[in-house]
Each structure stands twice: as structure tokens, then as C-alpha cells.
């Protein structure tokens, strides 16, 4: 048993790191590996992750880590039985891949302006909270060219756009994103999609 | 809720040995490490050693050789004990629990106030 | 072993005033520093960890900054039930305290 692809971890930079790798062979991963984790530099205990299937040779394991500071950094040992496969280390403040986004809200009430909030998946005592910045990806249902993204470079949660931007009487969604400068990290995953018809009073023609 | 409850003698003769017994509640001895801390008005507080989740023990170099924790997770208990004693370690013993990664301590047991004299 | 130099020793201070506490490292500990109150005759209390996060159930007037070597403790207004002593600690290995900080009612 080897490893074919090594270790690559993330860290959501608040209690999960999630660590991925590839088995050179399909591998029951949860029942003959095991990787072990421990900060380094501190008085700590080594704890393990069971990891579970990705793929027919894929393994991937959530290490939980109940909070992050920019120093931290992990010692990984990959084992199968007695049989140490792989050794490695993890500074989760380098490798942050921050929460998705939540609660996407399309509000449409507010004269022919739609506002589009969401949450900040951070509570505000996290690092991340304030260092934040978004991607809202909008798109039409009906009509795949329909396609554009807009970028959120101020901390609040939220965008307004004129509904006369997008065609109306059609279907659009709607998803948002995040990113943090400061720590260079790479986007969050999508949040869930929310949908909503687009309609608006055309201006009245004056001759 | 969280209680960590500490028993042991008050009073031991120099040379002989302490062992404080601390009784866990509200959580599992297999989720959490046990420290104990010592006080004194002589040295302050002092750091012993810590039983961790998974058994495995990290004593202060200074008190290694005297010191032993284990535990039993069905009576969630923790035993501390402490050979040869002397005046100097007169002070007060806590087990404290430790939160989550960081060896910090959330919840501390009562102490157990220990005198050496003869 | 890493040192820690907690100052002042003893401060007095009223009721609504602002006080900080001091604590030095002798070596680079990163943000691994926590602090503790204690009241007399009773058990430490966490108050702050990773140098600035507040421990759960502490109020929002107590405040921990610093890293590398220097960090304080700030209480901002002070109430009554905040008099006694403080002590940082430091999580590398070996842990070890600081030699406290007694706040005492002016």
C-alpha cells in the first residue's frame, strides 16, 4: 500500500481543516488508514482522524481544530496499521480556504433595485470576519450567455443592483462566494443558489 | 454542567506521598485532557503534567520523577500522585480541565490544600 | 524554560476606571498566551486565550492584545466584582505562569 498523491490540506481557519489524498489502489480508507495530527511548538496531544472515501482511491479526513492562530502549525503522520505511508506538516493559516456564504437572499421590493444579502460565515471574534470579500455570480435560467459576476470589495454583506440591468419577465439565480486577502486565500466554495423572476416597470416613453 | 471535584488529605509528613483523586462531571474524560497546577505563596503557580484524552501522559521536567497521573474513564476520575514530599511543596492542588487544542484550562476543581510538616 | 515577567505587581484602581496589566515573555510565544483571574479563596478563571479571544461567558470590557514577547490585559470600567488577581500563562512546553498582578480598590 503507497501513496500516489500525497496529502494536500485547507483550513476553514476556525474548526476544520480538510486534508485529501490519493491511495496508488482502491482503498478502504476508514478502516485501514489513519491520520494522526498535532501541533508542534506546544504542549499538545496527538489526535486522530478516520478518514473516509473519495473515490474509488481517494481518501479525504476533517481534522477538527477548535480555533486557529496565525502560528500554528501540524505535524501529519499518514498510517496504515504499524506502517507509517507518509509524513508531512500543515500551517492552516497558509493554506485557507474560508466557510461559504449563507443565506442568500434576493429582496425585490425595493423599487425596481434588487438588494442581495447574505451571511458572513464567520462570528465576529474570527479573524476572517472582517477581512472578507465577495463574488456575487448571477445568471439567467433561460439563456446560458446570461452570465455575469460582481465583485464585492466592501466588508458588507451585500449588493444592490438596478433590475433594469437584467432582462425582465425571465428567471435568474443567484450565488455568492468569499475570499480573504490578507491571508491569500483561495475562494470558499459556492453558497447554495436562490432563485427569483425578474420583472420591473419599463420607463415610460416620452416623445 | 462542568465540575471537576477534588479529594485528598489535608496534612502529609515530609518524605511521604499525596494522592488527590479528582471526579469529572458534564463531560468525558475520553474528550478532554486533565491537568493539574499547583499554588503557592513561595512560587506562584506552577504547572505539573496532564493526563490526555487518549491516556497518554506530559509531566513538568522538574517533577517528573516524582509524579504520576492516570485515570479511569468509566468512574470518570483522574489520580494524582506525588512521591516524596517535602516543606517546600506545601500549596494548593488543582486538576483543571483543558480546552479543546490549546493547553489552556476552562474549568478548575476546587483544590486541595496540602500542608507538609511533621 | 520560557519566562514570563507580569507587571505591575499590584495596582489600585476605582470602580469606572480603565487598568492594564502587562506580561512579558522571554522568548517569542507567538499568540499562545492565555489570562486568569482569581478571587480570593478561589479557583483561577479563564478570561482570555490565543492572546485576544475571550473565553466564553466573560464580558466584552475585558481585552487581550499582543504577541511575539508583549501582551496586556485591558478592563475597561472597572466593576466591583473585577478586583483580585490576574496571571498570564504561556502554552509552549513546559507551561509556565506569570507571577500575577493584584488589582486592588483604590
Known amino acids: 500500500m503507497k501513496v500516489l498523491q500525497e496529502p494536500t490540506c485547507v483550513s476553514d481557519y476556525m474548526s476544520i481543516s480538510t486534508c485529501e489524498w490519493k491511495m496508488n489502489g482502491p482503498t478502504n480508507c476508514s478502516t485501514e488508514l489513519r491520520l494522526l495530527y498535532q501541533l508542534v511548538f506546544l504542549l499538545s496531544e496527538a489526535h486522530t482522524c478516520i478518514p473516509e472515501n473519495n473515490g474509488g482511491a481517494g481518501c479525504v479526513c476533517h481534522l477538527l481544530m477548535d480555533d486557529v492562530v496565525s502560528a500554528d502549525n501540524y505535524t501529519l503522520d499518514l498510517w496504515a496499521g504499524q506502517q507509517l505511508l507518509w509524513k508531512g506538516s500543515f500551517k492552516p493559516s497558509e493554506h485557507v480556504k474560508p466557510r461559504a456564504p449563507g443565506n442568500l437572499t434576493v429582496h425585490t421590493n425595493v423599487s425596481d433595485t434588487l438588494l442581495l444579502t447574505w451571511s458572513n460565515p464567520y462570528p465576529p471574534d474570527n479573524y476572517l470576519y472582517n477581512h472578507l470579500t465577495y463574488a456575487v455570480n448571477i445568471w439567467s435560467e433561460n439563456d446560458p450567455a446570461d452570465f455575469r459576476i460582481y465583485n464585492v470589495t466592501y466588508l458588507e454583506p451585500s449588493l444592490r443592483i438596478a433590475a433594469s440591468t437584467l432582462k425582465s419577465g425571465i428567471s435568474y439565480r443567484a450565488r455568492v462566494r468569499a475570499w480573504a486577502q490578507c491571508y491569500n486565500t483561495t475562494w470558499s466554495e459556492w453558497s447554495p443558489s436562490t432563485k427569483w423572476h425578474n420583472s420591473y416597470r419599463e420607463p415610460f416613453e416620452q416623445h | 454542567q462542568v465540575q471537576l471535584k477534588q479529594s485528598g488529605p489535608g496534612l502529609v509528613q515530609p518524605s511521604q506521598s499525596l494522592s488527590v483523586t479528582c471526579t469529572v462531571s458534564?463531560?468525558?474524560?475520553?474528550?478532554?485532557?486533565v491537568h493539574w497546577v499547583r499554588q503557592s505563596p513561595g512560587k506562584g503557580l506552577e504547572w505539573l503534567g496532564v493526563?490526555?484524552?487518549?491516556?497518554?501522559?506530559d509531566y513538568n521536567a522538574a517533577f517528573k520523577s516524582r509524579l504520576s497521573i492516570s485515570k479511569d474513564n468509566s468512574k470518570s476520575q483522574v489520580f494524582f500522585k506525588m512521591n516524596s514530599l517535602q516543606a517546600d511543596d506545601t500549596a494548593i492542588y488543582y486538576c483543571?480541565?483543558?480546552?479543546?487544542?490549546?493547553?489552556?484550562?476552562?474549568?478548575w476543581g476546587q483544590g486541595t490544600t496540602l500542608t507538609v510538616s511533621s | 524554560d520560557i519566562q514570563m515577567t507580569q507587571s505591575p505587581a499590584s495596582l489600585s484602581a476605582s470602580v469606572g476606571e480603565t487598568v492594564t496589566i502587562t506580561c512579558r515573555a522571554s522568548?517569542?510565544?507567538?499568540?499562545?498566551l492565555a489570562w486568569y483571574q482569581q478571587k480570593q479563596g478561589k479557583s483561577p478563571q479563564l478570561l482570555v486565550y490565543?492572546?485576544?479571544t475571550l473565553a466564553e461567558g466573560v464580558p466584552s470590557r475585558f481585552s487581550g492584545s499582543g504577541s511575539g514577547t508583549q501582551f496586556s490585559l485591558k478592563i475597561n470600567s472597572l466593576q466591583p466584582e473585577d478586583f483580585g488577581s490576574y496571571y498570564c500563562?504561556?502554552?509552549?512546553?513546559?507551561?509556565?505562569f506569570g507571577a500575577g498582578t493584584k488589582l486592588e480598590v483604590k
Open positions: 483543571a480541565r483543558n480546552k479543546g487544542t490549546r493547553p489552556v484550562f476552562d474549568y
Open positions: 458534564g463531560f468525558s474524560l475520553t474528550n478532554y485532557g
Open positions: 493526563i490526555w484524552s487518549g491516556g497518554s501522559t
Open positions: 522568548e517569542n510565544i507567538y499568540s499562545y
Open positions: 490565543n492572546a485576544k
Open positions: 500563562q504561556h502554552y509552549v512546553s513546559p507551561l509556565t
